[in-house]
Amino acid sequence: GSQHIRAEKAMVDGSWLDLAKRSKLEAQPFAHLTINATDIPSGSHKVSLSSWYHDRGWAKISNMTFSNGKLIVNQDGFYYLYANICFRHHETSGDLATEYLQLMVYVTKTSIKIPSSHTLMKGGSTKYWSGNSEFHFYSINVGGFFKLRSGEEISIEVSNPSLLDPDQDATYFGAFKVRDID
Amino acid sequence: GSQHIRAEKAMVDGSWLDLAKRSKLEAQPFAHLTINATDIPSGSHKVSLSSWYHDRGWAKISNMTFSNGKLIVNQDGFYYLYANICFRHHETSGDLATEYLQLMVYVTKTSIKIPSSHTLMKGGSTKYWSGNSEFHFYSINVGGFFKLRSGEEISIEVSNPSLLDPDQDATYFGAFKVRDID
Amino acid sequence: GSQHIRAEKAMVDGSWLDLAKRSKLEAQPFAHLTINATDIPSGSHKVSLSSWYHDRGWAKISNMTFSNGKLIVNQDGFYYLYANICFRHHETSGDLATEYLQLMVYVTKTSIKIPSSHTLMKGGSTKYWSGNSEFHFYSINVGGFFKLRSGEEISIEVSNPSLLDPDQDATYFGAFKVRDID
C-alpha cells in the first residue's frame, strides 16, 4: 500500500515537474542581436541588414535561430520586439553626398509558408546634417508586441546604412517571448 | 494509512507550493526610477545621474536595490532595461551658450567583482537649438534585453544634464526581469 | 484504500491545474492598438486620439478592453506600456501653417473612481520643418513599467494630429502584463 502511494506521488510529482519545466521562465525564447559592421552596404537606399552578432558581447540568443541575416522564430507566441539604430557622421569620414537625409528603420516579418514580407514597426526622422557641424548623431528606437509563429522571420531594413554606428550599444535589435498564444 | 497518505499529499502539496512561490510572477524584480532634479550639475560634459526617486509618484522598486545613484541587481536573470530622457530649454531658463548640442544618454552596467563599466545602450541626437526659438524639446528612448547578475549595477549617464526635463513622466529609467538564466 | 488515494491525488492534481491555469503565461492581458486615421482631428493643439484598431492587421487585444478611445485595464498588475508615434508631411499635402513645430506624445492614465488624469510618459521634439525640403518625417517612441488597477484607462494625446502617419507600423500603442501586484 505504502509503495503504491509513493508511486502515485511520483506520478503527481513527475507530471508537475514536466509542467513546471514547460512553463518555467527559462524556457522562454529570446534574442538580442548587435550589428556586425564588417559588411555594411554603402549608399543611401533602403537595405536589409544581414550581418548581426548573436554570441559575442551583449549579443545572445536562446530558443530562436539566426540565419541568413534573419531572426527565425522557433516557438509560437506573443513577443516583444525592439530595435535601436544609431546613425552618425564625422567630417573626417568625408563629405556627405547630401545634407538632407532620411534616417529610417523598418522591422519586418517574413512568412515562409505564404511568401510575403510585412513591416511591423517603423521609425526615424528626416535630418538636415549641415557641413557647419563636424559631428552628427541620431538614434531611433522602436518596440512593439506581436504574435509570431514558428518559422516566421524578423529582419531589419535601414536607409543610409553607411552612416550606421557600429557599436554594440548603438545598433541592435531583439525579441523576447512574453506569453503563449491562447 | 489514511493519515500517512495525507502526509504524503502534504509533502507533494508543500513542495509544489514552494515551487509555485519561487516561480510566481510577483516574485519578479523590477524598478521604475524617476529623475530627482534638485541637484543637477550645470556642465555640458557627460555625467552620471545619481539622484532618482524610487518610491514616489510613478517610481517604484521591488527585489532590486537603489543605492548611490545606481540600480543594483539582487537576482540573476534576463531583464528588459529601458530609459526615457527628455531635454528641454525655454528662453527664460537661461541663454544657450551654444546652438550645437549633443543630447545623449548612456545606460551602463558596472560589475563590482571585476571593477569595470560598460555601456549597454546609447541613444540621442545632435541638435541645432537656435536662440531664435523660445522653446526647444527633445526626447530619447532606449531599451534592450540583457543578462544581469546579482551585484551588478545599472546607471545612467547623460550629456548636458542642465537641460534635463525634471518631470517624472519625462526622465526615467527602469528594468523588469523577464526570465531566469538557464 | 486505493480509491481514496486516487481521490487524494485527483485533488492535488486538480488544485495544481487551477494554480497552473491562473499563472499560465497565456492568461496575461495585452493590447497592441494601431491608429485608425479615418477620423483624425486637424489643428496643431494637443488632442486625445480616440480612434484605434484592436482587431485588424497587427492590432490585437486580450483580457483588456478598448472603449471610447481608451484602453481599459481589466486585471490588476504591473504592465509594460509603449507607444510609437510617427509624424510626416509631404509638400503635396499643402503648406505647413508654421515651420516651427512641437511634435509630442503623452501617454495618460485616467482613474474612474477618483476622476483624474495623469501623464505616465511623454516624448517628442521641437522641429524646424523648412519649406526647402519636400518631405519631413519624425518618430517618437516611449515605454515604461507601471502599476495599473482594474478600471483604469490608458489614452494617447498628441500635438499636431493632422501630421500623424496613418500606417499601422507607424502609429500605435500597447501594453502587456508582466507580473501581479504583490
Partner: antibody
Framework: EVQLLESGGGLVQPGGSLRLSCAAS????????MSWVRQAPGKGLEWVSG????????YYADSVKGRFTISRDNSKNTLYLQMNSLRAEDTAVYYC???????????????WGQGTLVTVSS | EIVLTQSPGTLSLSPGERATLSCRAS???????LAWYQQKPGQAPRLLIY???SRATGIPDRFSGSGSGTDFTLTISRLEPEDFAVFYC?????????FGQGTKVEIK
C-alpha cells in the same frame, strides 16, 4: 593665459553711437560664448548682452534691446558691441567677459577684461 | 527676472575674523546655479565660486559657498588683508542673468 582687452569707450552725446571692441587671446575664441557686463559709477554689475561661440544666437537685457547689437569676428578673435541711441543711464564701465565653455547655458563670467569707460553726456 | 538681495550692505571686520555674506533670491535658483565674485577698487571682478559651492581655479580654500533654492552664503573662514573688497552674487539659472547689489567687506 587668457586675456581680454576692451577698447572704443569715450564721451558721446545722448542719441549718439559708439562701437566697443574686445580683443581676445590665449584660448580658442570661436568655442566660447562671450558677454558684455557694465557697471555704472559707484553702482553694481549689470549683464548687457551675450553671444554664442558661432555667433548664431544673441541675447540682450531688456534695457538695451533694440539699441545695442552684439557681434563677433572669429577670424579676428574679436567681440563687438555696437551701441546706438545712447542715453545718460548707459554711462558705465563696460567689461567683456568669457563664458566658462563647460556649461550649455551661459553661466558665470571668467575671466573679465579690464573694462572701458563709456560716458553719455551733453 | 530673479532679483538677488545681498546682506548686509557693509560688513566691518578685522583680519582673522570670519565673514558670512548672504544672497537671497526672489525665486528659487534652479540647480544651485549661483556664482560669487570679488571686486577691488579700480579692478574687474574676479570669480570665486560657481555652482553654489565650487571654488574657481586658484581661489584659496578659506572661501566657501553654500546654499540652495533661495538662500545662498559665501563664507570667508579667516579674513586676510587682501580679502577686503566688494562681493557680488550672480544667478544663471534663468534669463536674464542677474547680480546682487553687492556687500562691502571693510576693515574695522
Amino acid at each position: 593665459e587668457v586675456q581680454l582687452l576692451e577698447s572704443g569707450g569715450g564721451l558721446v552725446q545722448p542719441g549718439g553711437s559708439l562701437r566697443l571692441s574686445c580683443a581676445a587671446s590665449g584660448f580658442t575664441f570661436s568655442s566660447y560664448a562671450m558677454s558684455w557686463v557694465r557697471q555704472a559709477p559707484g553702482k553694481g554689475l549689470e549683464w548687457v548682452s551675450g553671444i554664442t561661440g558661432s555667433g548664431g544666437s544673441t541675447y540682450y537685457a531688456d534695457s538695451v534691446k533694440g539699441r545695442f547689437t552684439i557681434s563677433r569676428d572669429n577670424s579676428k578673435n574679436t567681440l563687438y558691441l555696437q551701441m546706438n541711441s545712447l542715453r545718460a543711464e548707459d554711462t558705465a564701465v563696460y567689461y567683456c567677459a568669457k563664458d566658462p565653455g563647460t556649461t550649455v547655458i551661459m553661466s558665470w563670467f571668467d575671466p573679465w577684461g579690464q573694462g572701458t569707460l563709456v560716458t553719455v553726456s551733453s | 527676472e530673479i532679483v538677488l538681495t545681498q546682506s548686509p550692505g557693509t560688513l566691518s571686520l578685522s583680519p582673522g575674523e570670519r565673514a558670512t555674506l548672504s544672497c537671497r533670491a526672489s525665486q528659487s535658483v534652479r540647480g544651485r546655479y549661483l556664482a560669487w565674485y570679488q571686486q577691488k577698487p579700480g579692478q574687474a571682478p574676479r570669480l570665486l565660486i560657481y555652482q553654489g559651492s565650487s571654488r574657481a581655479t586658484g581661489i584659496p580654500d578659506r572661501f566657501s559657498g553654500s546654499g540652495s533654492g533661495t538662500d545662498f552664503t559665501l563664507t570667508i573662514s579667516r579674513l586676510e588683508p587682501e580679502d577686503f573688497a566688494v562681493f557680488y552674487c550672480q544667478q544663471y539659472g534663468s534669463s536674464p542673468r542677474t547680480f546682487g547689489q553687492g556687500t562691502k567687506v571693510e576693515i574695522k
